[in-house]
C-alpha cells in the first residue's frame, strides 16, 4: 500500500547523517519504474534540505540533528512518478514526529521572587508561588516535568523547615508554628526546580519571605512608677512624660501608644497624649491643680495600641504620684469687680466703702491695699483694712472723669509672700445724683429790634439728673423786668424773653434768675444787643449817610 | 571604625586554587552579610557571591561550582575558595559588606569595601 | 541576569556644573508591597574601592555631600551631582539588588572639562 506510519525520531541524533529512517514504496512497481520525492516544511520548503530521499529507493533520508523544541513535527508528501513524470499515486502524508530528549534545564521565572506572611500564622498558610518552565516535554515523557523543592533557609531559626513548596505548583506554604517577626524578620529560601519530576537537572533561585508584624505584643512602661512636682494653678503643664517599650513594628498602628487615665482623676484635671514621634505619654494639665484643696495625685494609665491586640494579652499600667507645690498665689478681691452706690459731693474722709481680697494661700498672709488708678484723685484707701474714703469732690457731671454716673477705679492687694503677689480688683462707683447744679439758659448773648421786637427763645439745660430739672421758673431781676419780660414755655424747658418797651440801640445785661424743680437757683446775665431795626435782626445794621 | 582587609591574592597557573581571606573589624561581623566583587584590570565591577547571616550563599553563574564563599564568625573572617582558574578570572577581589541584614532594610547595597587582592591566573 | 546598561560611557563637565548619568535596567527594580527600588550608586576614584553613595534609588548614603542626588523608579535611574566639584572625578556605577545575581553598570567615568 502506498502508506506510511507516523515516523518517530528522537531529537539531537548522533547520526551518522544522512541516516535513512524509512522506505517508500509503491507496489506499482511492478510495472513501471518509479521515482520518489518528497515536498513539504524541511523538504523543499523552509528549513529546507532537513529531510531527503533516494529517488530511485524511496529511502526518506534525515541530513541532521533535530531539535524539538524548535519544530516537534513535520508534515511532509511523499511523491510517486513513473519515467515519463506521470503521476502513478496521490500524494502521502508522511508525519515525521520528534522525540524529545532531556536536554533543557528548568528555568525559573525570575531569579527572586519575593513575598510576605503574617507572623503568627498557622501551619497550612500560603505565602507565595514560585514558577519555573522547562522546554522540555512534559506531556508524552517526564523531561519538562518540574519538581520543587526548597534546598535551604535562612535563618534556621526557630528551625529549618518553617516552610515547605509544594512539589508540582510551587507554592510555598507555611509548615510549622513560631514565625515571629520580633525575633526574625525576613527568610531568605534557596529553592530548586528539578526536571525528570525531581530526577533530572536541577536549577536554583532565591525566594525571600518577609514576616508581616501583628500586633503580638503589649506595649509596656518602662518604668512603672512615676513620681512628679506640679505646681499649682499650671494649666497645659507637662506634669511627666511616660515611656513604653513595644517590640512590634515601630511606627506602624500595632506599635503606637494609646494611653488612657483609668482612676485617680476625680477633678478630671489631667490629660494624656502620645508623642508622635517617641511614642511616649505626655500627661499635662488640663485644668490649675489646687495645693490647699489636695496636694497629691494618684494617677493609674494604661497603655495600649491604635490596633488592638490579635491575642488576649495583659495590658501595662503606670502609677504616677503627682505632688501638687505650693505657690504664693495672688490676692483676690471679692467680688472682682465691686458696685458702690455714692452720692456725689460728700465730705471729704466720708468712708466710700470697704473693698477687700483674699488670699487663697493657707497662711496667715498680710494684705496690703492700695490706689492703683483713680484718675481724677477722689479717693484714698487704708493700706490695712482697704476702707475707700473720698479725699476729693466726686462729682457727677465731671465729663472727663465720669461715665454714665460711674467713676472706675482699679485698686491693688499684696501679700507679703516671697516673692509677694498682687492682685487687683475694680471699684465702680455709681454716683447719685445732688441737686449741685442750677439751669443755665442758652445762648447767654441775644440781638434785637427796638421796634416791632421778636421774642428771644433761650434753651435751658441742667447737668443734673431728674427729678433735680424740668420744669423751670424764670424771673428778672435787678430791675431787667422794667424792660423785658422772661417767660417759661408748657414743657418748661426753655425761657421766652421778650423787650417790652423801647431802648436806644446799645448793648445791656439782663439779669435773668432760673431755678430746677429742685428750687436750685442760677443767676445768669444775658447780654443783649439792641439796634434800631423793625422785626428780626441778626446783626445791627450800620448808620445810614446820604449822596 | 568598619575596616575590611583582604589578602591571600597571587600569582596562579590556569587550573589551579588559590584562597582568598577577607578579615573584619569595627562592626559586629555574624550580623551582616558580607559579598566578594571582583573588577578586572581597566573593566567595571562583578559581583560573585554572598554569604548571609546563617552561611547560606548565592553565586553569580561565571563563578557557580569553582568558588565558593565561607565565614568563620568566630575569626571575624570571609573566605573565598577559587578552584579552576582561568585567565579571565584575573581581577582585584574586593569583599564587602553588605549595609542591611535583610532584603527589606537594603542587605544588597554594600556600604563598606576592603582595598581589595590582585589575582593574576597566567601561565 | 538583569542588565544594567549606563550612559554615557564618560562625560566631562565644567566645576560647578551639574553632571547627569542615567542607568537602564532590562526589569523593573521597584517592589510594589514597599514600593522601594532595590537601586544602588557608586563611585570609585583611581585607585580605590568603589564607595556607596545611594541606595534605593534616591536615599543617600551617610556623609554623602548633598549634591549628590538620585532619582528614577522602575527601569530608568538618574545620579546628578547639582555642582562638579574637583574631588568628583571618578567612575560611577549603578547596581541592582533586585534579584541574585546583583548586577553592576558598566560604569560612567565623570571627567572635569
Known amino acids: 500500500d502506498w502508506v506510511v506510519a507516523p515516523i518517530s525520531v528522537p531529537e539531537n541524533g548522533k547520526g551518522p547523517f544522512p541516516q535513512r529512517l524509512n522506505q517508500l514504496k509503491s507496489n506499482k512497481d511492478r510495472d513501471t519504474k518509479i521515482f520518489y520525492s518528497i515536498t513539504g516544511p524541511g523538504a523543499d520548503s523552509p528549513p529546507e534540505g532537513v529531510f531527503a530521499v533516494e529517488k530511485e529507493t524511496g529511502w526518506l533520508l534525515l541530513n541532521k540533528p533535530l531539535d524539538r523544541e524548535e519544530i516537534a513535527k513535520y508534515e511532509l508528501f511523499g511523491h510517486a512518478v513513473s519515467e515519463n513524470g506521470a503521476s502513478v499515486e496521490d500524494p502521502m502524508n508522511i508525519s515525521i514526529i520528534v522525540t524529545d530528549q532531556n536536554d533543557h534545564k528548568p528555568k525559573f521565572t525570575q531569579d527572586t521572587f519575593r513575598g510576605s506572611v503574617l507572623e503568627g500564622v498557622l501551619p497550612g498558610t500560603s505565602v507565595m508561588q514560585v514558577t519555573a518552565t522547562d522546554e522540555d516535554d512534559a506531556i508524552y515523557t517526564y523531561n519538562g516535568v518540574v519538581a520543587y523543592s526548597i534546598h535551604s533557609q535562612e535563618p534556621k531559626d526557630p528551625h529549618d523547615l518553617m516552610f515547605t513548596i509544594h512539589r508540582s505548583t510551587g507554592t510555598i506554604s507555611v509548615i510549622s508554628s513560631g514565625l515571629d517577626r520580633e525575633k526574625v524578620p525576613e527568610y531568605t529560601l534557596t529553592i530548586q526546580a528539578t526536571d525528570m519530576d525531581g530526577d533530572g537537572s536541577t536549577t536554583t533561585a532565591v525566594a525571600v519571605v518577609e514576616i508581616l508584624d501583628a500586633n503580638d505584643n503589649a506595649p509596656m512602661f518602662d518604668p512603672q512608677k512615676y513620681e512628679a512636682h506640679v505646681p499649682e494653678n499650671a494649666v497645659g503643664h507637662e506634669v511627666q512624660r511616660l515611656t513604653v517599650t513595644d517590640l512590634d513594628a515601630p511606627n506602624s498602628p500595632a506599635w503606637r501608644a494609646t494611653y488612657l487615665i483609668m482612676g485617680g482623676d476625680d477633678g478630671d484635671h489631667f490629660t494624656i497624649t502620645t508623642h508622635p514621634e517617641s511614642n511616649q505619654g505626655i500627661l499635662t494639665t488640663r485644668k490649675g491643680l489646687d495645693f490647699e484643696a489636695k496636694n497629691q495625685h494618684t494617677l493609674y494609665v494604661e497603655v495600649t495600641n491604635e490596633a488592638p491586640f490579635v491575642l488576649k494579652l495583659p495590658t501595662s499600667t503606670a502609677t504616677i504620684v503627682v505632688h501638687v507645690e505650693d505657690v504664693n498665689e495672688a490676692p483676690v478681691f471679692v467680688p472682682p469687680s465691686k458696685v458702690v452706690e455714692v452720692q456725689e459731693g460728700i465730705p471729704t474722709g466720708e468712708p466710700v466703702c470697704v473693698y477687700t481680697a483674699e488670699d487663697p494661700d493657707k497662711e496667715n498672709q498680710k494684705i496690703s491695699y492700695r490706689i492703683l488708678r483713680d484718675p481724677a484723685g477722689w479717693l484714698a484707701m487704708d493700706p490695712d483694712s482697704g476702707q475707700v474714703t473720698a479725699v476729693g469732690t466726686l462729682d457727677r457731671e465731671d465729663e472727663q472723669f465720669v461715665r454714665n454716673n460711674i467713676y472706675e477705679v482699679m485698686v491693688l492687694a499684696m501679700d507679703n509672700g516671697s516673692p509677694p503677689t498682687t492682685g487687683t480688683g475694680t471699684l465702680l462707683l455709681t454716683l447719685i445724683d445732688v441737686n449741685d447744679h442750677g439751669p443755665v439758659p442758652e445762648p447767654r448773648q441775644i440781638t434785637i429790634c427796638n421796634q416791632s421786637p421778636v421774642r428771644q427763645v433761650l434753651n435751658i439745660t441742667d447737668k443734673d439728673l431728674s427729678p433735680h430739672t424740668s420744669p423751670f421758673q424764670a424771673q428778672l431781676t435787678d430791675d431787667s423786668d422794667i424792660y423785658w419780660t422772661a417767660e417759661v414755655n408748657e414743657e418748661g424747658d426753655t425761657v421766652v424773653l421778650s423787650l417790652k418797651k423801647f431802648l436806644k440801640q446799645d448793648t445791656y445785661d439782663v439779669h435773668l434768675s432760673l431755678s430746677d424743680h429742685g428750687n436750685k437757683e442760677q443767676l445768669t446775665v444775658i447780654r443783649a444787643t439792641v439796634c434800631d431795626c423793625h422785626g428780626h435782626v441778626e446783626t445791627c445794621p450800620g448808620p445810614w449817610k446820604g449822596g | 571604625e568598619v575596616q575590611l582587609l583582604e589578602s591571600g591574592g597571587g600569582l596562579v597557573q590556569p587550573g589551579g586554587s588559590l584562597r582568598l581571606s577577607c578579615a573584619a573589624s569595627g562592626f559586629s561581623f555574624s550580623s551582616y552579610p558580607i559579598n566578594w566583587v571582583r573588577q578586572a584590570p581597566g573593566k567595571g565591577l562583578e559581583w560573585l557571591s554572598v554569604?548571609?547571616?546563617?552561611?547560606?550563599?548565592n553565586y553569580a553563574s561565571s563563578v557557580k561550582g569553582r568558588f565558593t564563599i565561607s565565614r568563620d564568625n568566630s575569626k571575624n573572617t570571609l573566605y573565598l575558595q577559587m578552584n579552576s582558574l582561568r585567565a579571565e578570572d584575573t581581577a582585584v577581589y574586593y569583599c564587602?559588606?553588605?549595609?542591611?541584614?535583610?532584603?527589606?532594610?537594603?542587605?544588597?547595597?554594600?556600604?563598606?569595601w576592603g582595598q581589595g587582592t590582585l589575582v593574576t591566573v597566567s601561565s | 541576569d538583569i542588565v544594567m546598561t549606563q550612559s554615557p560611557d564618560s562625560l566631562a563637565v565644567s566645576l560647578g556644573e551639574r553632571a547627569t548619568i542615567n542607568c537602564k535596567s532590562s526589569?523593573?527594580?521597584?517592589?510594589?508591597?514597599?514600593?522601594?527600588?532595590?537601586l544602588a550608586w557608586y563611585q570609585q576614584k583611581p585607585g580605590q574601592p568603589p564607595k556607596l553613595l545611594i541606595y534605593?534609588?534616591?536615599t543617600r548614603e551617610s556623609g554623602v555631600p548633598d549634591r549628590f542626588s538620585g532619582s528614577g523608579s522602575g527601569t530608568d535611574f538618574t545620579l546628578t551631582i547639582s555642582s562638579v566639584q574637583a574631588e568628583d572625578v571618578a567612575v560611577y556605577y549603578c547596581?541592582?539588588?533586585?534579584?541574585?545575581?546583583?548586577?553592576f553598570g558598566q560604569g560612567t567615568k565623570l571627567e572635569i572639562k
Open positions: 547596581q541592582q539588588y533586585y534579584s541574585y545575581p546583583y548586577t
Open positions: 534605593w534609588a534616591s
Open positions: 564587602a559588606k553588605s549595609r542591611g541584614v535583610y532584603d527589606f532594610d537594603g542587605r544588597g547595597a554594600m556600604d563598606y
Open positions: 526589569q523593573s527594580l521597584l517592589y510594589s508591597s514597599n514600593q522601594k527600588n532595590y
Open positions: 554569604i548571609w547571616t546563617g552561611g547560606g550563599t
